[in-house]
């Protein structure tokens, strides 16, 4: 069964800067990746970035840099100040779509006990949705 993992890290050098990394563990080609915060993409969350494997990347503040790391994983750097700044308990969600086969989404947040800049290796997060 395909799975999605999400890793959230706060940068030690800039405490208002977060890095979100997401990956898809499964076979099949990914047609779109959507990163959101405040909840899942289809349940009131706000889209931060969308990445298409061939047509490019779109992103919205406070997203600073979204990129593909591999064919099945992405990273997103967030940089905020004031109202648009993420906080330590913000939930980030990643949705990997493979049209028309289905989509898989998982969410994560900064580990409560982690120090800035330190993070455990990514582990598969529970699948919230599979069409």
């Amino acid at each position: 069964t395909p799975e999605v993992w999400v890793q959230v890290r706060m940068e030690a050098t800039e405490l208002s800067s977060f890095t979100i990394r997401c990956g898809f563990l499964g076979s099949g080609s990914i047609s779109l990746v959507t990163v959101s915060w405040g909840g899942p993409n289809g349940a009131g969350g706000t889209t931060l970035a969308v990445l298409h494997p061939e047509r490019g990347i779109r992103q919205w503040a406070p997203a600073r840099q979204a990129r593909w790391e591999t064919q099945s994983s992405i990273s997103l750097i967030l940089e905020g100040s004031g109202a648009s700044s993420p906080c330590a308990n913000t939930t980030f969600c990643c949705k990997f779509a493979s049209f028309p086969e289905g989509s898989w989404e998982a969410c994560g947040s900064l580990p409560p006990s982690s120090d800035p800049g330190l993070s455990a290796p990514p582990t598969p997060a529970p699948i919230l949705r599979a069409d």
Epitope: S31, S36, N41, A43, H52, K95, A97, S103
Partner: nanobody, 121 residues
């Protein structure tokens, strides 16, 4: 959660017409296009038509002049009027909500289960 439910598919003779409907509910922030994709048996899927957030309809060349896409915002519905149908229009048609990456492409973020259109005599 976003829900898209298509209806209106079926068997039609060449030259005939069908109207597909898509009932939409739920919410995805920042999506800026809604449209129809299709996948013929054994073939790659293709975008048939979509409407931008500015209301401009766009069509793949093979359906221009034959298909018309429209929206009813009050009913949260999308439609595809298909006229002068041909055998090569046979496919599963999917209603999609997505993101624009260029003028002619709406990348699907959410889609329905699909409705089968068969054009045959």
């Amino acid at each position: 959660e976003v829900q898209l439910v298509e209806s209106g598919g079926g068997l039609v003779q060449p030259g005939g017409s069908l109207r597909l409907s898509c009932a939409a509910s739920g919410y995805t922030s920042r999506t800026d296009c809604m449209g129809w994709f299709r996948q013929a048996p054994g073939k790659e899927h293709e975008g048939v038509a979509h409407i931008d957030s500015d209301g401009i309809p766009r069509y793949v060349d093979s359906v221009k002049g034959r298909f018309t896409i429209s929206q009813d915002h009050a009913k949260n519905s999308l439609y595809l009027q298909m006229n002068s149908l041909r055998a090569e229009d046979t496919a599963v048609y999917y209603c999609v909500v997505g993101f624009k990456f260029d003028e002619d492409y709406c990348a699907p973020n959410d889609w329905g289960q699909g409705t089968m259109v068969t054009v045959s005599s």
